[in-house]
Interface confidence: low
């Protein structure tokens, strides 16, 4: 239904607190360099304006679209061109082009320092003094670093953050209480960020149809007792919601997400038997709970998939009559039977099925032609299963850090032209798949591994797109989203790469490494490892092991020395010489 004032409508639906949070996220995602104080001033102005529209929908400018109102606010910022360069050119455009222009200037890798968590006491003091401002800073800092973060989900994480601080800041040992809890929230939020970026990439590159297919597969796995029409309705709504958030329509997105949660809770009987516990929660938690819901039990009496999609003599007729619906039902039927497959795999199978029907239905004897299609799925299913098996075995043998290093070597060999920081980030994230997925029961491993890897590789593609340096990476990133992971897995050592010359300064370290937190120490070592591989792309595993072992001993020895600086200065050149020799 149409509303006289869109902004008043959203303010009433969302309530002041969520409204303000979402406006702050929107501004922080568009203008990633602005300080919190500047954004919060704009948020207050927009909120005050929304309140006047609630009081009188006919008031001046209340009929303007939210994009127009937000864009006008952003374009009125003084010194916009000084701080943002060509983004200021967007302000010369009219809506909807202006918003599109803002979206194109979102930076996936903004030049911002890593978000440093303050020391526990300081954190609790500032939280207790002004919880609203503290959580506002959290929203701002996360949103500007992750310009595609799913806004309603970020509000949920801010709520979690609030809960943790409320609980831990009353404890005597605040740090012991805060650290593990905030680490857990951070880990979940970072995974959520790469997953959502993948959804927006899917929407931007391949459109709504591709995203909807993803949603149909996912919903069918979760809700195998729901009818196809129900799954279609849910997938349509989820597609709309994600399109809105990816497009910067955060108020509408959050409002529609709450509506969908309400619909699901009112229609549990036709969706899933597992929803009740979620439906008793408040709105943000309810939506989050529904998004993470466990799979319902598969109906016991499901007939073989072959009956309708292979053995039926009218397969080609049914396909010709309504291609999208027929393929949609195939994806639904296959997915509801296979919660143990990744969505990427299910979409590859649906694509294979479609290609088979396209070919066979044009031939003289279609049933004979498509009769073997299910058997032809086998290699497509085996490939990711083998990937999971070999990688989980390697993870169990090496542990997370060792596994990350193995992945780093592999990916540096595949794409040595990619910048070392990007390779290290990607390998560290890819390496976490072990901890995240390999400990799960067998039936959950494949979907966990492949869908997580796909999201991480999407981040690699997004960063590479900004400064393309590797033809192989460009090739894998340009293809279909569901083929990306197999494409990267199939890459081998890049034979065209001219090895980097050995630079002693790349392998020169100082005593400052000793005081770094463990994570930063690991990154330093992994940076050196990537540089070694770039210098010697065909180095053997043993050679790299020797050099890295030597390096670890050197750092350990010098960090324990009385005169650390002297140790690094004298032992460093020896290490460099030994490394060159070992790799000769």
């Amino acid at each position: 239904e149409a509303h006289k004032s869109e902004i008043a409508h959203r303010f009433k639906d969302l309530g002041e607190q969520h409204f303000k949070g979402l406006v702050l996220i929107a501004f922080s995602q568009y203008l990633q360099k602005c300080p919190y104080e500047e954004h919060i001033k704009l948020v207050q102005e927009v909120t005050d304006f929304a309140k006047t529209c609630v009081a009188d929908e006919n008031a001046e400018n209340c009929d303007k679209s939210i994009h127009t109102l937000f864009g006008d606010k952003l374009c009125a910022i003084p010194k916009l061109r000084d701080n943002y360069g060509e983004l200021a050119d967007c302000c010369a455009k009219q809506e909807p082009e202006r918003n599109e222009c803002f979206l194109q200037h979102k930076d996936d890798n903004p030049n911002l320092p890593p978000f440093q968590r303050p020391e526990a006491e300081a954190m609790c003091t500032s939280f207790q003094e002004n919880p609203t401002s503290f959580l506002g800073h959290y929203l701002h800092e996360v949103a500007r670093r992750h310009p595609y973060f799913y806004a309603p989900e970020l509000l949920y994480y801010a709520e979690k953050y609030n809960e943790v601080l409320t609980q831990c800041c009353t404890e005597s040992d605040k740090a012991a209480c805060l650290t593990p809890k905030l680490d857990a929230v951070k880990e979940k939020a970072l995974v959520a960020a790469v997953r959502q970026r993948m959804k927006c990439s899917s929407m931007q590159r391949f459109g709504e149809r591709a995203f909807k297919a993803w949603a149909v597969a996912r919903m069918s796995q979760r809700f195998p007792n729901a009818e196809f029409a129900e799954i279609t309705k849910l997938a349509t709504d989820v597609t709309k919601i994600n399109k809105e958030c990816c497009h910067g329509d955060l108020l509408e997105c959050a409002d529609d997400r709450a509506e969908l949660a309400k619909y699901m809770c009112e229609n549990q009987a036709t969706i899933s038997s597992k929803l009740q516990a979620c439906c008793d929660k408040p709105v943000l938690q309810k939506s989050q709970c529904l998004a993470e819901i466990e799979h319902d039990n598969i109906p016991a009496d499901l007939p073989s998939i072959a009956a309708d999609f292979v053995e039926d003599k009218e397969v080609c007729k049914n396909y010709a009559e309504a291609k999208d619906v027929f393929l949609g039902t195939f994806l639904y039927e296959y997915s509801r039977r296979h919660p143990d497959y990744s969505v990427s795999l299910l979409l590859r199978l649906a694509k294979k099925y479609e290609a088979t029907l396209e070919k066979c239905c044009a031939e003289g004897d279609p049933p004979a032609c498509y009769g073997t299609v299910l058997a032809e799925f086998q290699p497509l299913v085996e490939e990711p299963k083998n990937l999971v098996k070999t990688n989980c075995e390697l993870y169990e043998k090496l542990g997370e850090y060792g596994f990350q290093n193995a992945v780093l070597v592999r990916y540096t060999q595949k794409a040595p032209q990619v910048s070392t920081p990007t390779l290290v980030e990607a390998a560290r994230n890819l390496g976490r798949v072990g901890t995240k997925c390999c400990t799960l029961p067998e039936a959950q491993r494949l979907p966990c591994v492949e869908d997580y890897l796909s999201a991480i590789l999407n981040r690699l593609c997004v960063l590479h797109e900004k400064t393309p340096v590797s033809e192989k990476v460009t090739k894998c990133c340009s293809g279909s989203l569901v083929e990306r992971r197999p494409c990267f897995s199939a890459l081998t050592v890049d034979e065209t790469y001219v090895p980097k010359e050995f630079k002693a300064e790349t392998f020169t370290f100082h005593s400052d490494i000793c005081t770094l937190p463990d994570k930063e120490k690991q990154i330093k070592k992994q940076t050196a490892l990537a540089e070694l591989v770039k210098h010697k792309p065909k180095a053997t595993e043993d050679q790299l092991k020797t050099v890295m072992g030597d390096f670890a001993q050197f750092v350990d020895k010098c960090c324990k020395a009385a005169d650390k600086d002297n140790c690094f200065a004298t032992e460093g050149p020896n290490l460099v010489a030994r490394s060159k020799e070992a790799l000769a």
Epitope: E227, F228, A229, E230, T232, K233, T236, D237, Y263, N267, D308, F309, E314, N318, Y319, E321, A322, V325, F326, G328, T329, F330, Y332, E333
Partner: nanobody
Framework: EVQLLESGGGLVQPGGSLRLSCAAS????????MLWVRQAPGKGLEWVSV????????YYADSVKGRFTISRDNSKNTLYLQMNSLRAEDTAVYYC????????????WGQGTLVTVSS
């Protein structure tokens, strides 16, 4: 026995509008998703639009998006298709069908209503 009866077809000029209706009986209409499909002269069946049992439209074929609107009145057991900005290529027999629960076969059809768009 399931019965679907379409009406509202006829001759209309390009750019004109028509509203098709489909009266349903013999099954629980308010728990069934419904759809419109059409068959142009000498062509195969083309699916037009699906509406979910709750009344939220789910799908429109690209060829009709923005011009056609599917709706339903569960209290009257009736399905509608509002067709605006009609074009010559919309000329076809329009059928309403009960959406199947699992696969792509449409079990129950009406007898169809002819829409002709011509100047």
């Amino acid at each position: 026995e399931v019965q679907l009866l379409e009406s509202g077809g006829g001759l209309v000029q390009p750019g004109g509008s028509l509203r098709l209706s489909c009266a349903a009986s013999g099954f629980t209409f308010d728990t069934s998703s419904m759809l419109w499909v059409r068959q142009a002269p000498g062509k195969g069946l083309e699916w037009v639009s699906v509406i979910h049992q709750s009344g939220t439209p789910t799908y429109y074929a690209d060829s009709v998006k923005g011009r056609f609107t599917i709706s339903r009145d569960n209290s009257k057991n009736t399905l509608y298709l509002q067709m605006n900005s009609l074009r010559a290529e919309d000329t076809a027999v329009y059928y309403c069908a009960k959406f199947p629960s699992t696969h792509g076969k449409f079990d129950y059809w009406g007898q169809g209503t002819l829409v002709t768009v011509s100047s």
